[in-house]
């Protein structure tokens, strides 16, 4: 590593540091597709942004390999619970990689929020938060899934969201 | 950008990197005012600290613009629940900006924890965690609100807290 | 600070920046000891890793002093609740320091999840997430405890985990 090379690397690092990859995506009316796919997200309006990461069909796409703190919150709620609903709601962050055909579970939570209403006619609310550090390669994608997504309550982008930043 | 300019910027960056803005504020007996205002926080004692951020009347005040991961946890609990307002508890992080007269919702959760008491005991506990990345300008403030704040349980600063760090 | 000294520091900083301390440890079959000690974690397989931090008997051990965002999630669940179990489950992050004989509470949550079982099913699930920024000195350790740990559900390292990164 000669001084010139070091200098170049430092200049490069400063520039890349200015855009330490980060993103915060927010829930929107179009988030719930009912198709069995992942949740979709707003990437530009309001509080949503992408910086050094890209977005494709619900997925945060990594452009720079590294360790990322990824997180998601979903707002759950209902009036009673759908009949036949499994007593468990699963909220998870999943990785898609070109090197493997199936999604890989990264961070997952299971909750039984319907028991929070003391009778079948009662309104209930619950929230699920996930966050953790994972290694992601360039080109890999992270998505959010909720089963049963009918219980996700969207409003204004503040109650259900998805984000990441490099650590 | 000549080499001298780059050098200065790098030196500057190194110094600013040493004080990457961060804060962790903790719940205290004085946190709950009952006045309808935001929660107040301990800024110095125990686990609480401010580094490159300031504090004013419950608010974390940004001194350096950028993207921040902001977070808050509140410990909720009670013996039964008050009727009226509190079938839903709302916990949120809100932004105050000189450019707009009203607080802006950033991250919000709604929960219905009272239905959780077991069959005989009326005691229930629940916890709400929020975290996400938002862009904040110098001079902007972030506060925590809980409605109904009577359900927030304070003890020793470990169960209810509020923090941020630049990403 | 002469230019040579500054240069050395910048080179040093670049190298240390490359290994900004971070870790993510995952739940495993051996996590629950029943001994009254902290939870144990997987440090290498699957999603687990250590970078600039070390591990010892359930503890993340700090090698470089600084402010760290520490976090843990535990997946809770059961079929009913153990008779005699207090209606409260406590999940916490605790610090061990050579300067003090007892563990220090850092971040703690209390929950009463057993009341979540719906009328038709005694099965319940809940999740507890903790995260916050704390200052840690070299040699200090952070551990996770859950009381009653019998209610922690392990599976594949995605539902219960423990991590940290320097901010």
């Amino acid at each position: 590593d000669g001084p010139a090379g070091s200098w170049e690397q430092l200049i490069q690092e400063r520039r890349s540091h200015e855009v330490n990859p980060a993103a915060h995506l927010t829930g929107a009316n179009s988030s719930l597709t009912g198709s069995g796919g992942p949740l979709l997200w707003e990437t530009q309006l309001g509080l949503a942004f992408l910086r050094g990461l890209s977005y494709h069909d619900g997925a945060l796409v990594v452009t720079k390999a590294g360790y990322y703190y990824i997180y998601s919150k979903v707002q759950l709620g209902g009036v009673g619970c759908p009949l036949g609903l499994a007593s468990t709601i699963t909220h998870g962050l999943y990785k898609r990689t070109p090197r493997y055909p199936e999604e890989l579970e990264l961070l997952v939570s299971q909750q039984s929020p319907c028991g929070r209403a003391t009778s079948s006619s009662r309104v209930w609310w619950d929230s699920s938060f996930l966050g953790g550090v994972v290694h992601l390669e360039a080109g890999e994608e992270v998505v959010v899934r909720v089963l049963d997504e009918r219980l996700v309550r969207l409003r204004d982008g503040t109650r259900s969201y998805f984000g990441a930043f490099m650590v | 950008d000549g080499p001298a300019g780059s050098w200065e910027q790098l030196i500057q960056e190194r110094r600013s990197h040493e004080v990457n803005p961060a804060a962790h504020l903790t719940g205290a007996n004085s946190s709950l005012t009952g006045s309808g205002g935001p929660l107040l926080w301990e800024t110095q004692l125990g686990l609480a600290f401010l580094r490159g951020l300031s504090y004013h009347d419950g608010a974390l005040v940004v001194t350096k613009a950028g993207y921040y991961y902001i977070y808050s946890k509140v410990q909720l609990g009670g013996v039964g629940c008050p009727l009226g307002l509190a079938s839903t508890i709302t916990h949120g992080l809100y932004k105050r900006t000189p450019r707009y007269p009203e607080e802006l919702e950033l991250l919000v959760s709604q929960q219905s924890p009272c239905g959780r008491a077991t069959s005989s005991s009326r005691v229930w506990w629940d916890s709400s965690f929020l975290g996400g990345v938002v862009h904040l300008e110098a001079g902007e403030e972030v506060v925590v609100r809980v409605l109904d704040e009577r359900l927030v349980r304070l003890r020793d600063g470990t169960r209810s807290y509020f923090g941020a760090f630049m990403v | 600070d002469g230019p040579a000294g500054s240069w050395e520091q910048l080179i040093q900083e670049r190298r240390s920046h490359e290994v900004n301390p971070a870790a993510h440890l995952t739940g495993a079959n051996s996590s629950l000891t029943g001994s009254g000690g902290p939870l144990l974690w997987e440090t290498q397989l699957g999603l687990a890793f250590l970078r600039g931090l070390s591990y010892h008997d359930g503890a993340l051990v700090v090698t470089k002093a600084g402010y760290y965002y520490i976090y843990s999630k535990v997946q809770l669940g059961g079929v009913g609740c153990p008779l005699g179990l207090a209606s409260t489950i406590t999940h916490g992050l605790y610090k061990r320091t050579p300067r003090y004989p007892e563990e220090l509470e850092l971040l703690v949550s209390q929950q009463s999840p057993c009341g979540r079982a719906t009328s038709s099913s005694r099965v319940w699930w809940d999740s507890s997430f903790l995260g916050g920024v704390v200052h840690l000195e070299a040699g200090e350790e952070v551990v996770v405890r859950v009381l009653d740990e019998r209610l922690v559900r392990l599976r594949d390292g995605t539902r219960s985990y423990f991590g940290a990164f320097m901010v």
């Epitope: - | 013996v79 009727l83 069959s119 009326r122 | -």
Partner: antibody, heavy 120, light 111 residues
């Protein structure tokens, strides 16, 4: 001011039923649980159960589950307790009370009581 | 069920002296630093009246000569100085667990 006014004394035959009323005023009816308490002559106090006036959800002392039915009429801010299959053991004064969550669920206001006598 | 044991069953106290009534719960009635124990006064032909809530808090309009203390399982009601109008039956009651339960009562007589 807060008031709970209960219906008048009842003399009923064994096996019959009775409905007691408790009309509230001076506060927001849907913001406080209504409790019912039994007191046999010369005896202590027994909690029968409670009702949430917001949605009509009752919660009973197991001992009274098959004896009492609790209902509310939000439009008139009135709570009702229906007692069935009466026996001499049910002869008592029955009180409705307001439960105040801010006071640790204490019963801060009481009705004047309704005396129920079961006799053939 | 939480059993509330009140003692004594009755007591006679001279005017101006101190009356002390004890209540023991069969298990702790504490939550987050508060004792969920309430005290009521009942006079013949009248409904009970709340005196003390959450172990030590005086209800509005209740004279300061009434005070409550205790935590966990052991609680005390004190009246000092006792006045003529304090002749009544006093009940403790826990409000932390269903079914809510009362003590059997303590009859206070003024000598």
């Amino acid at each position: 001011q807060v008031q709970l006014k209960q219906s008048g004394a009842e003399l009923v035959k064994p096996g019959a039923s009775v409905r007691l009323s408790c009309k509230t005023s001076g506060y927001t009816f849907t913001n406080y649980y209504v409790y019912w308490v039994k007191q046999r002559p010369g005896q202590g106090l027994e909690w029968i159960g409670e009702i949430n006036p917001t949605n009509g959800d009752p919660n009973f002392n197991e001992k009274f589950k098959s004896k009492a039915t609790l209902t509310v009429d939000k439009s008139s801010s009135t709570a009702y307790m229906h007692l069935s299959s009466l026996t001499s053991e049910d002869s008592a004064v029955y009180y409705c009370t307001r439960s105040n969550w801010d006071y640790g669920n204490a019963m801060d206001f009481w009705g004047q009581g309704t005396s129920v006598t079961v006799s053939s | 069920d939480i059993v509330m044991t009140q003692s004594p069953a009755s007591l006679a106290v001279s005017l101006g002296q101190r009356a002390t009534i004890s209540c023991k719960a069969s298990q702790s009635v504490d939550f987050d630093g508060d004792g969920y124990m309430n005290w009521y006064q009942q006079k013949p032909g009248q409904p009970p009246k709340l005196l003390i809530y959450k172990a030590s808090h005086l209800d509005s309009g209740i004279p300061a000569r009434f005070s409550g203390s205790g935590s966990g399982t052991d609680f005390t009601l004190n009246i000092h100085p006792v006045e003529e109008e304090d002749a009544a039956t006093y009940y403790c009651q826990q409000s932390i667990e269903d079914p809510l339960t009362f003590g059997d009562g303590t009859r206070l007589e003024i000598k």
